[in-house]
Amino acid sequence: MAVTACQGLGFVVSLIGIAGIIAATCMDQWSTQDLYNNPVTAVFNYQGLWRSCVRESSGFTECRGYFTLLGLPAMLQAVRALMIVGIVLGAIGLLVSIFALKCIRIGSMEDSAKANMTLTSGIMFIVSGLCAIAGVSVFANMLVTNFWMSTANMYTGMGGMVQTVQTRYTFGAALFVGWVAGGLTLIGGVMMCIACRGLAPEETNYKAVSYHASGHSVAYKPGGFKASTGFGSNTKNKKIYDGGARTEDEVQSYPSKHDYV
């Protein structure tokens, strides 16, 4: 029962996480105009992965897509790629995990197959979450770098003609949505991997046989013999799960160069 709950909860958490990753990727507010020096601007700028927008005091909002591919910064392209990979992996993971759910019966699918599928989807969710977190963190790092560069050089000459105040950008709502969504997908993936452990059927235990010796009766349970078989099919499950554990380790050892953001 606990395994079913863990699997179901992992699925739901991952589903919410992937929905969040999709939402973050589509959102326009990845970076928003920093209003520290100008809190009463009548023109508010914000940018997404796909287009930049300007909201005017009049209520009019104008958005322009980035219609160039080669002219975009490599970092932005990398962030786009990470988010798309995260969405694709997450979507495949969701599809796999639906069939892996213990509460859903599909033909005569064995529990071992469901365990494998649960683990596969779990790993996919973990990688998906990592992609989203990495993508958002790379973008955040890019913003921090640009923010301090523009702070150090607040006034830049436009074509040598005139002095204009450079617009500074800070973290937009999409970054926080992305971080949370990536984290949820990651947690969901870990839960799926944990659920996988209890899903696989243990090799049928031999029934205890009583040997009646003269004088006193001793019951022998051939646990030692079972151990000598190497846990049968469980060896495979244990091994795969350990792989999942290594993925968890990867989460912990993931480069923390964005920690300061």
Epitope: N45, V54, S57, E62, Q163, T167
Partner: antibody, heavy 120, light 113 residues
Framework: EVMLVESGGGLVQPGGSLRLSCAAS????????MSWVRQTPEKRLEWVAT????????YYLDSVKGRFTISRDNAKNTLYLQMNSLRAEDTALYYC?????????????WGQGTLITVSS | DIVMTQSPDSLAVSLGERATINCKSS????????????LAWYQQKPGQPPKLLIY???TRESGVPDRFSGSGFGTDFTLTISSLQAEDVAVYYC?????????FGAGTKLEIK
């Protein structure tokens, strides 16, 4: 046809209060950001306050902040300016103006104005 | 606050001649987000409210004759009347539409020589 008609002006003593109204017609009032602009006796134009379509955001000239309150009743298509603690320097012709949706925050329609004289 | 400085204070031009009014802002009115300048020009005739002529520094408001044109970028802007007509006699104001408070220039009085 877009029409803005101001009312509520008159003579008031320093420290007194007054409420200006602006009746709007000929457009979807709730969609537009509205402003009050005044013209001093020296013919200088001075923006006073702005309120966005939904009424959630308001902006004020520093010298009127805390004394004037801009508000709107979208059901009645009316813009208001509540003026308290009036001073002699508030004497002006007060215009109600609409901020054009696609006019880069420019004021595309103006009323005829209502005169306020603050004097003892 | 952004200070808008108009020049000249008054201008006398012969009918059919070109009239040029300048406006300078203390801060840039250019928005990098959409590459637009947030400056408007208004015309005010005696006893009337101001009328919008130009917005976004160079876009003519609908119904405004094409003899009126706006130009400029960042902090320096110009309103040009290519061929002055008798009905163009008025006071012209420039306005910052970029940052609150939405400040106006002191105005330029245009007369016929």
């Amino acid at each position: 046809e877009v029409m803005l008609v101001e009312s509520g002006g008159g003579l008031v003593q320093p420290g007194g209060s007054l409420r200006l109204s602006c009746a709007a017609s000929g457009f979807t009032f709730s969609t537009y950001t509205m402003s009050w602009v005044r013209q001093t006796p020296e013919k200088r134009l001075e923006w006073v306050a702005t309120i966005v379509g939904g009424g959630g955001y308001t902006y004020y000239l520093d010298s009127v902040k805390g004394r004037f309150t801009i508000s709107r009743d979208n059901a009645k298509n009316t813009l208001y300016l509540q003026m308290n603690s009036l001073r002699a320097e508030d004497t002006a012709l007060y215009y109600c103006a609409r901020m054009g949706l696609t006019q880069r925050n420019a004021l595309d329609y103006w009323g005829q104005g209502t005169l306020i004289t603050v004097s003892s | 606050d952004i200070v808008m400085t108009q020049s000249p204070d008054s201008l006398a031009v012969s009918l059919g001649e070109r009239a040029t009014i300048n406006c300078k802002s203390s801060q840039s009115l250019f928005n990098s987000g959409n590459q637009k300048n947030y400056l408007a020009w208004y015309q005010q005739k005696p006893g009337q409210p101001p009328k919008l002529l130009i917005y976004g520094a160079s876009t003519r408001e609908s119904g405004v004759p094409d003899r009126f044109s706006g130009s400029g970028f960042g902090t320096d802007f110009t309103l040009t009347i290519s061929s002055l007509q008798a009905e163009d006699v008025a006071v012209y104001y420039c306005q910052n539409d970029h940052t609150y408070p939405l400040t106006f220039g002191a105005g330029t009085k245009l007369e016929i020589k």
